[in-house]
């Protein structure tokens, strides 16, 4: 029987800069029941606080609700693992909520084949930003990426769309059924999951030349 091994806070995510959750990985348990507590302070403060909510994020997590979340202030946190034989502490983790946003996927993905008489045909893709993200305040800049492939192909073709919420693709294989998905990322932060796939049948008379 031994003191617990060193835990590690390995991930923090926020859906929208208003709340966030951090997760830790326990060290070895030392063969005894182990209690974990997360403590934190904000930069410039010395007062330590304990995690406000160990439940919402699931096992080995700490959730910071709206009243505990402030932007532009670095949180300095650590996890303490304790059993009957002793304690061990994780390394301190410095967290700025602005940098840990992982939004929901974009919404309302629409895909259409456009065949104008005077120009080359193209695939027109349009979507909306996720609802939790308030783009009007200017706090967020979302970047978008599109991926598509013929239904039976192994490789995805990826296009970076920048801040646009629509995109045109010219080079497609006629007669193929394509899968299309989109994802988004704040200027600082993490890519969302890919949106659910939308399928589009490219007409056989779709000409690329």
């Amino acid at each position: 029987q031994l003191p617990p091994g060193k835990p590690e806070i390995f991930k923090c995510r926020s859906p929208n800069k208003e709340t966030f959750t951090c997760w830790w990985r326990p060290g070895t348990d030392g063969g005894l029941p182990t209690n974990y507590s997360l403590t934190y302070h904000r930069e410039g403060e010395t007062l330590m606080h304990e995690c406000p909510d160990y439940i919402t994020g699931g096992p080995n997590s700490c959730h910071f609700g709206k009243q505990y979340t402030s932007m532009w202030r670095t949180y300095i946190m650590m996890v303490n693992a304790t059993n009957q034989m002793g304690s061990s502490f994780s390394d301190e983790l410095y967290v700025d909520v602005t940098y840990i946003v992982q939004p929901d996927p974009p919404l309302e993905l629409a895909v259409e084949v456009k065949q104008p008489e005077d120009r080359k045909p193209y695939l027109w893709i349009k979507w909306s930003p996720p609802t939790l993200i308030d783009l009007k305040t200017g706090w967020f800049t979302l970047l978008y990426e599109i991926r598509l492939k013929p239904e039976k192909a192994a490789e995805w073709e990826i296009h970076f769309a920048g801040q646009q919420t629509e995109f045109k693709i010219l080079s497609l294989h006629p007669g193929q059924k394509y899968l299309v998905q989109v994802r988004c990322k704040p200027d600082h932060g993490y890519w969302s999951a890919w949106s659910p796939a939308t399928f589009i049948q490219i007409p056989s008379d779709f000409t690329m030349n």
Partner: antibody, heavy 120, light 107 residues
């Protein structure tokens, strides 16, 4: 404890490429951005670029944009910096540096440095 | 890009004395400034982040101040191990940039 161990010194010819590695240990590699900074002999520090090892998303200093490629291999917890079209001015010590936290780009852990000498 | 200008280039100080290093940014950077110490043949070591926050394990004799475009690193009472080169760095906008360094040498 956190360690960043870089590959050994290299001597390269002008026009060739060099690839420097940085093996991370003591923490979860995908948690923190990794940066590359260089220092010419007797000179100051110059940031080259950065990568998020969780998804290999990268940003570069425009000065190096066409010549530098930063990659990360999650399976071996190793970051790489490749610099092409080498010239004598690229002679420098190249450092990998780990982001200080989940936040802005200040660097709390540094590799030991790799000296790259470009000479004909 | 934002240019970080450090002064003086060299500072001669006696052990036990106070050292004041200056760093000026060419544009507003808020408090997005870090300070590093580098000794010959070694990698830089982080001292201060967010202009005034001491990093874990850094002695209290190191302090940072300033915001906007003017920043200061103060070493209240120089110890023998503090003689080194000091760099400021801004992380307000890409590309992240460093000052040219101030060498603190023994007087």
């Amino acid at each position: 404890q956190v360690q960043l161990v870089q590959s050994g010194a290299e001597v390269k010819k002008p026009g060739s490429s060099v690839k420097v590695s940085c093996k991370a240990s003591g923490y979860t590699f995908t948690t923190y951005w990794m940066h590359w900074v260089r220092q010419a002999p007797g000179q100051g520090l110059e940031w080259m670029g950065e990568i998020d090892p969780s998804d290999s998303y990268s940003n570069y200093n425009q000065k190096f944009k066409d010549r530098v490629t930063i990659t990360a291999d999650k399976s071996t917890s190793t970051a790489y910096m490749e610099l092409s079209s080498l010239r004598s001015e690229d002679t420098a010590v190249y450092y990998c540096a780990r982001n200080g936290g989940l936040g802005p780009a200040w660097f709390s852990y540094w590799g030991q440095g790799t000296l790259v000498t470009v000479s004909s | 890009e934002i240019v970080m200008t450090q002064s003086p280039a060299t500072l001669s100080v006696s052990p036990g004395e106070r050292a004041t290093l200056s760093c000026k940014a060419s544009q507003y950077v808020g408090t997005a400034v870090a300070w590093y110490q580098q000794k010959p043949g070694q990698a830089p070591r982080l001292l201060i982040y967010s202009a005034s926050n001491r990093y874990t394990g850094i002695p209290a004799r190191f302090s940072g101040s300033g915001s906007g475009t003017e920043f200061t690193l103060t070493i209240s009472s120089l110890q023998s191990e503090d003689f080194a080169v000091y760099y400021c760095q801004q992380y307000s906008s890409y590309p992240w940039t460093f000052g040219g360094g101030t060498k603190v040498e023994i007087k």
